[in-house]
């Protein structure tokens, strides 16, 4: 099933201590899906979308950007025929970068 879209949403982090907010959204015909956010291939957070919505927004508290490294991806799962769970393709990656400090 098709991959979700992924985007960084404000407030954008300005340092590694700031929270990171990431929105993931499934295509139109998959409301209420279960979403998984990955970083560097490891599960960061799991959320279920409201039954009438196609997406969720993840809040990663400050400091969670330190480890593991690598880009963020998300994926969603839905119950298909015979109540079998079907997983989407992984989203495109999202990289979180911080402004270079000016001294």
């Amino acid at each position: 099933i098709p991959a979700p879209s992924i985007r960084l949403v404000p407030p954008y982090p300005s340092s590694q201590e700031d929270p990171i907010h990431i929105a993931c959204m499934a295509p139109g015909n998959f409301p209420g899906a279960n979403f998984t956010l990955y970083r560097g291939g490891q599960v960061v957070q799991l959320l279920q979308a409201p039954t009438d919505q196609r997406g969720v927004t993840f809040n990663l508290s400050g400091g969670s950007s330190k480890a593991p490294g690598g880009p963020f991806h998300c994926q969603y799962g839905v119950l298909g025929e015979l109540n079998q769970s079907q997983l989407s393709d992984l989203s495109e990656p999202v990289n979180v970068s911080f402004p270079v400090p000016t001294w």
């Epitope: 949403v9 404000p10 407030p11 929270p19 907010h21 990431i22 929105a23 959204m25 957070q45 799991l46 959320l47 279920q48 979308a49 409201p50 919505q53 997406g55 969720v56 927004t57 993840f58 809040n59 508290s61």
Partner: antibody, heavy 120, light 110 residues
């Protein structure tokens, strides 16, 4: 299904305190950001406060900052609003509401509200 | 005084199209925060109508649509029906991370 049930409203004198509670069920409470929104009689919606899924971040409207405290007990699936130094202008229906995710985003689910009346 | 500005009332005849504007500033809508729309019937809790600027929850008719540009957003309702009479609110966030609502717009179907 998602259920949010507010309690603790009532009549209170100016300057006194009140604590509202919101019992949540039908979802994994500890995964979602939660809000309080209020509505004065005959007026519009006013956002009051939000707390992150783990309680680590809290933000308030300027009108209640320093007087109201939002908190949560994830082991009890309960959201709280401690209201101190109440004023007549705090009179409103207070709604407990759930965000669509662990971040603020949209308010996907609302309780039915509890009425707080501040009057001498 | 609400942070987001909406017209207090709009009206239209059945079948017509109406729009409700929501004007913010560079610290909220203009800063990239998403805009959400809620509908409230008298004596009931608000209900989500549009989320993340343009998306309809399932069950909301496609007569309802929304857009966002710069510091403002708007909600459009086509094919107006008597049951559309309600109060409509836009909502976003501010750069201090507090939520902000519009003052609400009362829609009257003539």
């Amino acid at each position: 299904q998602v259920q949010l049930v507010e309690s603790g409203g009532g009549v209170v004198q100016p300057g006194r305190s009140l604590r509202l509670s919101c019992a949540a069920s039908g979802f994994t409470f500890s995964s979602y950001a939660m809000h309080w929104v209020r509505q004065a009689p005959g007026k519009g919606l006013e956002w009051v406060a939000v707390i992150s899924y783990d309680g680590s971040n809290k933000y308030y409207a300027d009108s209640v900052k320093g007087r109201f405290t939002i908190s949560r007990d994830n082991s009890k699936n309960t959201l709280y609003l401690q209201m101190n130094s109440l004023r007549a202008e705090d009179t409103a229906v207070y709604y407990c509401a759930r965000s669509s995710g662990s971040s603020w985003s949209n308010i996907a689910y609302w309780g039915q509200g509890t009425l707080v009346t501040v009057s001498s | 005084q609400s942070v987001l500005t909406q017209p207090p009332s709009v009206s239209g005849a059945p079948g017509q199209r109406v729009t409700i504007s929501c004007i913010g500033s560079s610290s909220n809508i203009g800063a990239g925060y998403d805009v959400h729309w809620y509908r409230q019937l008298p004596g009931t809790a608000p209900k989500l109508l549009i989320y993340d600027n343009t998306n309809r929850p399932s069950g909301v008719p496609d007569r309802f649509s929304a857009s966002k540009s710069g510091i403002s957003a708007s909600l459009a309702i086509t094919g107006l029906q008597a049951e559309d009479e309600a109060d409509y609110y836009c909502q976003s966030y501010d750069s201090n991370l507090s939520g902000v609502f519009g003052g609400g717009t009362q829609l009257t179907v003539l």
